[in-house]
C-alpha cells in the first residue's frame, strides 16, 4: 500500500514553474496574429497552417482553397500575391535578405484558370521587387536596379529605365539610407489607382561616401561589403521622381515631376508619394534641415503629357520647436473629393492631431484634440474616419481604435475597442477591407494577443480569427512575472515606466534592478503589450526587477517631451533614466548595490552614457550595437534631431555627446560591449572606437563581437548573445548559476 498525502491547497503553485532561458530562446511562448489579405469588401485570403492559400467569404461564411500547398512546394514558395483580376498568382521563392526591408527573390507566375505555371517570357532572377497593378494583371518589377513592365504575365517585358547600376543608380527601389530612414519600404514605385500610371523614384548615389567592412565568410580571403552610406554631414543621394503611362509606355516615356521651388533651393529629400486619382498625385518633400516639409499636389496635363504642380497646391508644414513630424512626416489620407485630405500634425498646444485640409494648412479644421495624440489614420470612407490614439484613460502606451462619423454634423466620435476586452486588450491595430465593409482587429495585449473580425457598419464582432489557445494552455503552469505601468512626476516632466516584478514579489525585500532602455527620439518602450521574452525570464527565474522608462524625447505625449532632445541627443534621455532609478530606489525594494542597465542600438548609446555618468548608481551594464558618436550614424536620421556637424551649426554637441569622451568614467563599472562585425546600420566602427578609447584610458571592460552578423544578431548568435548577457548579469548581481 502506497500512502499519498492528500493534495495540499496550494498544489497548483507547486506544479507551476519559472520561465527558463531555453523557453525564451526556443520561442516556446511566442504568439500568433491574423492579418487578413483582403481582396474585396468581403473576401480575404489566408495561408493555412498546412500552406494552402484559402479564400474566405465573410458573407457566405464559405472558404475554399485557390492554391494548393503542392503547387507552393513545387517551387519552394514562401510567399504569394494574387493579381487583382484573380487570374494569376505570383509565387515567391529563394528569399535572400538584404537590409531591413529589402530582399531579392525568384518569382513564378501561376495561371489559376488552367492550373499551370506561365511559360515563355519568364521573369529574370533574382528580382529586387515585383508587384501587380491595382487593377488587372500588369506587372512591374525591378531587376538589376532597372524597372520593367509587363502588360500580361506571359508578355515580353518593356524596359522603363536603362541607367540602373549597382551602388550608383537605383530605380524603383531605395538606396540604403532611404530604405532605412525615410521610406521604410523595399520599394520606391507606386501604381496609380487604376494602373494607368506608374510613378517611381530614381536615387543617384554616385557621390555618396562608401562604408566598407569585411565579411569573413568561409573563404581564404574575406569579402568587402561596400554600401553608399551618407553619415551626418556627408553628401546625400540625389532623388528624382518620374511617372510613366503604362498603357503606352513608349509614347512619351517617363516624365519627371517638378520639385517645389522652396525645396529645390538647397539639399532636400523626397519623403513619400500618394496617388489621389489616376491623374492626380501627391508628393511630399523635406528640406535637408528637416523642419520644413512641403506637400505638393500635381495634376496630369493631357495636352502636354506632363505633370503640373501649381504653387496653389503646395502645403507647407513647419516646426519651430523641433523637426517636422514625429519619426516621419505623416502622410495624407485623401477624401472622396480628391483634393481635400486628413493629416496628423501638431496642433497649437503641441499635440499631434488629425486635421482636415481643404484649401490651405492655415485654414485646417482640427478633427481631434486633447492632451493625447492621434497616432494613425487607418481609413476614410464617405461617412467614417477610423484612427488610433492613446486617449483612453490617459495611458500613452495604449492604442485604441476610434471611428469619427464625418458624414453627419457635428461629427460624433466612438471608441470601437475601448470596452471590448478591457483587461486583455489595450493595444490594438486594425486592417480594413475595401470601403471598410469589414475589418480585423489585432490586439497585442497586455493579455494574450487575439485577432477578431468585425462588421464595418455596426462594429459587431463576427468571429475570432486567432486567440492563441495553445499559448494560453502552455502558460497555465508558468510563473509569469507581474507587470505594472505607472508614472513618476519629476520637475514638471511625466516619466511613464513599466516595472516587471518577480512572481513572488514582496515589497519588504530587496531586489536587483535591471533598466532596459531604448530612448530614441519618437520611440516608446512603455506599451501595454504582451511579451514573454528575456526580461520576463530574468524576473521569473532570476528574481530581478526590470524597469523600462520613457523619458524626454519619447513619443505620443506631446511636443514638449518629444522635442526636448532636439539638437542635444544624449543628455536628457540619460538624465531621465537616472532620475527614474533614484525614484525606484526610494520605493524601498531595490538593492541599490545591484543596479544594471542595458540597451541595444540607441539603447546601447544611452546605457553607455548612463554607465559613464559618474553617478555611482550602476554596478554594471551592457551595450549591444551602440551608436558611439553621431558623426558615425546616417545623415537622414542624425541630422533630423541634431542638425549638421559643422562649426556654424551643431558640431560642438556632436563632439560632446560621444561615448568615447567619457571613457574615464567607465573605470568604476563593469561594462559589456557587444557588436556584430557586419552591421550595415550602426557600423562596428562605433564599438571599435569605444574599445579604443577604453584601452587608451586603460579601463578594463568586457566585449563580444559576432562575426558576419548585422544589427539584429539573429540565428545562433541570438542564443549565444542572451546566454552571454545572462551570465554577465548573474555575475554582476552575485546570483548563483
Amino acid at each position: 500500500i502506497v500512502l499519498r498525502p492528500s493534495r495540499v491547497h496550494n498544489s497548483e503553485e507547486n506544479t507551476m514553474r519559472a520561465l527558463t532561458l531555453k523557453d525564451i530562446l526556443n520561442g516556446t511562448f511566442s504568439y500568433k496574429t491574423f492579418f487578413p489579405n483582403w481582396i474585396s469588401g468581403q473576401e480575404y485570403l489566408h495561408q493555412s497552417a498546412d500552406n494552402n492559400i484559402v479564400l474566405y467569404n465573410i458573407e457566405t461564411g464559405q472558404s475554399y482553397t485557390i492554391l494548393s500547398n503542392r503547387t507552393m512546394k513545387s517551387v519552394n514558395a514562401s510567399n504569394y500575391g494574387l493579381s487583382p483580376d484573380r487570374q494569376f498568382v505570383y509565387l515567391e521563392s529563394d528569399y535572400s535578405k538584404l537590409w531591413r526591408y529589402s530582399y531579392t527573390a525568384t518569382y513564378y507566375i501561376y495561371d489559376l484558370s488552367n492550373g499551370e505555371f506561365v511559360r515563355g517570357n519568364e521573369l529574370p532572377r533574382p528580382i529586387q521587387y515585383l508587384c501587380w497593378s491595382p487593377v488587372g494583371s500588369k506587372l512591374a518589377y525591378v531587376y538589376q536596379n532597372n524597372i520593367y513592365l509587363k502588360q500580361r504575365p506571359g508578355d515580353p517585358p518593356f524596359q522603363i529605365t536603362f541607367n540602373g547600376r549597382e551602388n550608383k543608380i537605383f530605380n524603383g527601389i531605395p538606396d540604403w539610407v532611404y530604405e532605412e530612414e525615410m521610406l521604410a519600404t523595399k520599394y520606391a514605385l507606386w501604381w496609380s489607382p487604376n494602373g494607368k500610371f506608374l510613378a517611381y523614384a530614381e536615387f543617384n548615389d554616385t557621390d555618396i561616401p562608401v562604408i566598407a567592412y569585411s565579411y569573413y565568410g568561409d573563404e581564404q580571403y574575406p569579402r568587402t561589403i561596400n554600401i553608399p552610406y551618407p553619415k551626418a554631414g556627408a553628401k546625400n543621394p540625389v532623388v528624382r521622381i518620374f511617372i510613366i503611362d503604362t498603357t503606352y509606355p513608349a509614347y512619351v516615356g517617363p516624365q519627371e515631376v517638378p520639385v517645389p521651388a522652396m525645396i529645390a533651393s538647397s539639399d532636400y529629400y523626397f519623403s513619400w508619394l500618394t496617388w489621389v486619382t489616376d491623374e492626380r498625385v501627391c508628393l511630399q518633400w523635406l528640406k535637408r534641415v528637416q523642419n520644413v516639409s512641403v506637400l505638393s499636389i500635381c495634376d496630369f496635363r493631357e495636352d502636354w503629357q506632363t505633370w503640373d504642380c501649381p504653387k496653389t497646391q503646395e502645403h507647407i508644414e513647419e516646426s519651430r520647436t523641433g523637426w517636422a513630424g514625429g519619426f516621419f512626416v505623416s502622410t495624407p489620407v485623401f477624401s472622396y473629393d480628391a483634393i481635400s485630405y486628413y493629416k496628423i500634425f501638431s496642433d497649437k498646444d503641441g499635440y499631434k492631431h488629425i486635421h482636415y485640409i481643404k484649401d490651405t494648412v492655415e485654414n485646417a479644421i482640427q478633427i481631434t484634440s486633447g492632451k493625447w495624440e492621434a497616432i494613425n489614420i487607418f481609413r476614410v470612407t464617405q461617412d467614417s474616419l477610423f484612427y488610433s490614439s492613446n486617449e483612453f484613460e490617459e495611458y500613452p502606451g495604449r492604442r485604441n481604435i476610434y471611428r469619427i462619423s464625418i458624414g453627419s454634423y457635428p461629427p460624433s466620435k466612438k471608441c470601437v475597442t475601448c470596452h471590448l476586452r478591457k483587461e486583455r486588450c489595450q493595444y490594438y491595430t486594425a486592417s480594413f477591407s475595401d470601403y471598410a465593409k469589414y475589418y480585423a482587429l489585432v490586439c497585442y495585449g497586455p493579455g494574450i494577443p487575439i485577432s477578431t473580425l468585425h462588421d464595418g457598419r455596426t462594429d459587431q464582432e463576427i468571429k475570432i480569427l486567432e486567440e492563441n489557445k495553445e499559448l494560453e494552455n502552455a502558460l497555465k503552469n508558468i510563473q509569469l512575472p507581474k507587470e505594472e505601468i505607472k508614472k513618476l512626476e519629476v520637475d514638471e516632466i511625466t516619466l511613464w515606466y513599466k516595472m516587471i516584478l518577480p512572481p513572488q514579489f514582496d515589497r519588504s525585500k530587496k531586489y536587483p534592478l535591471l533598466i532596459q532602455v531604448y530612448g530614441g527620439p519618437c520611440s516608446q518602450s512603455v506599451r501595454s503589450v504582451f511579451a514573454v521574452n528575456w526580461i520576463s525570464y530574468l524576473a521569473s527565474k532570476e528574481g530581478m526587477v526590470i524597469a523600462l522608462v520613457d523619458g524626454r524625447g519619447t513619443a505620443f505625449q506631446g511636443d514638449k517631451l518629444l522635442y526636448a532632445v532636439y539638437r542635444k541627443l544624449g543628455v536628457y534621455e540619460v538624465e531621465d533614466q537616472i532620475t527614474a532609478v533614484r525614484k525606484f530606489i526610494e520605493m524601498g525594494f531595490i538593492d541599490e548595490k545591484r543596479i544594471a542597465i542595458w540597451g541595444w542600438s540607441y539603447g546601447g548609446y544611452v546605457s553607455s552614457l548612463a554607465l559613464a555618468s559618474g553617478t555611482g548608481l550602476f554596478k554594471c551594464g551592457i551595450a549591444v550595437a551602440p551608436v558611439s558618436s553621431w558623426e558615425y550614424y546616417a545623415s537622414v536620421y542624425t541630422e533630423r534631431f541634431m542638425g549638421l556637424p559643422t562649426k556654424d551649426d551643431n558640431l560642438e554637441h556632436y563632439k560632446n555627446s560621444t561615448v568615447m569622451a567619457r571613457a574615464e568614467y567607465f573605470r568604476n563599472v563593469d561594462y559589456l560591449l557587444i557588436h556584430g562585425t557586419a552591421d550595415d546600420n550602426v557600423h562596428f566602427q562605433n564599438s571599435a572606437q569605444i574599445a579604443k578609447a577604453l584601452v587608451n584610458a586603460q579601463v578594463d571592460f568586457q566585449a563580444m563581437w559576432y562575426s558576419d552578423q548585422n544589427h539584429g544578431l539573429s540565428g545562433l548568435s541570438t542564443n549565444h548573445l542572451y546566454t552571454h548577457m545572462t551570465h554577465f548579469l548573474k555575475q554582476c548581481f552575485s546570483l548563483s548559476d
Epitope: S40, G41, Q42, N57, T65, I66
Partner: nanobody, 117 residues
Framework: QVQLQESGGGLVQAGGSLRLSCAAS????????MGWYRQALGKQREFVAG???????NYADSVKGRFAISRDNDKNTVYLQMNSLKPEDTAVYYC???????????WGQGTQVTVSS
C-alpha cells in the same frame, strides 16, 4: 458534393448572341465571387469574366465590351450575356468561383458554344 450546372450554349452565327446560365447545388453558394472560364479545343482553359459577391466585375481583354456577367442572388444563378460573338469565342464554357476552387469536383461539364462564320 458541389454541382455547378452550366447551360445556354449552342450554335450561333458570328455577330449573334447567347446567354449562359450557371446554377449551383451542394455546398458552394453562388453568393461567392463567381467567374466564367472557357477552353477551346487544344488550348488551355482561360478566364472570361468574373463578378465579386459585391457586384464588381472584371473581363478578359478579348471579351471587353461584348460580354456582360451578372448574377441573380435570389435564384442562386450567374449569367454570361455574350454579344457580337466571333468564331474565336468557340469553346466549352465553364463557371466556377472566381478565382476557381481547387477541388476534384471543382469544374462542371461546361456548355459548348460554337460560333460559325
Amino acid at each position: 458534393q458541389v454541382q455547378l450546372q452550366e447551360s445556354g450554349g449552342g450554335l450561333v452565327q458570328a455577330g449573334g448572341s447567347l446567354r449562359l446560365s450557371c446554377a449551383a447545388s451542394g455546398s458552394i453558394s453562388m453568393l461567392n465571387s463567381m467567374g466564367w472560364y472557357r477552353q477551346a479545343l487544344g488550348k488551355q482553359r482561360e478566364f472570361v469574366a468574373g463578378i465579386t459577391s459585391g457586384g464588381r466585375t472584371n473581363y478578359a481583354d478579348s471579351v471587353k465590351g461584348r460580354f456582360a456577367i451578372s448574377r441573380d442572388n435570389d435564384k442562386n444563378t450567374v449569367y454570361l450575356q455574350m454579344n457580337s460573338l466571333k468564331p474565336e469565342d468557340t469553346a466549352v464554357y465553364y463557371c466556377n468561383t472566381w478565382p476557381p476552387r481547387i477541388a476534384f469536383d471543382s469544374w462542371g461539364q461546361g456548355t459548348q458554344v460554337t460560333v460559325s462564320s
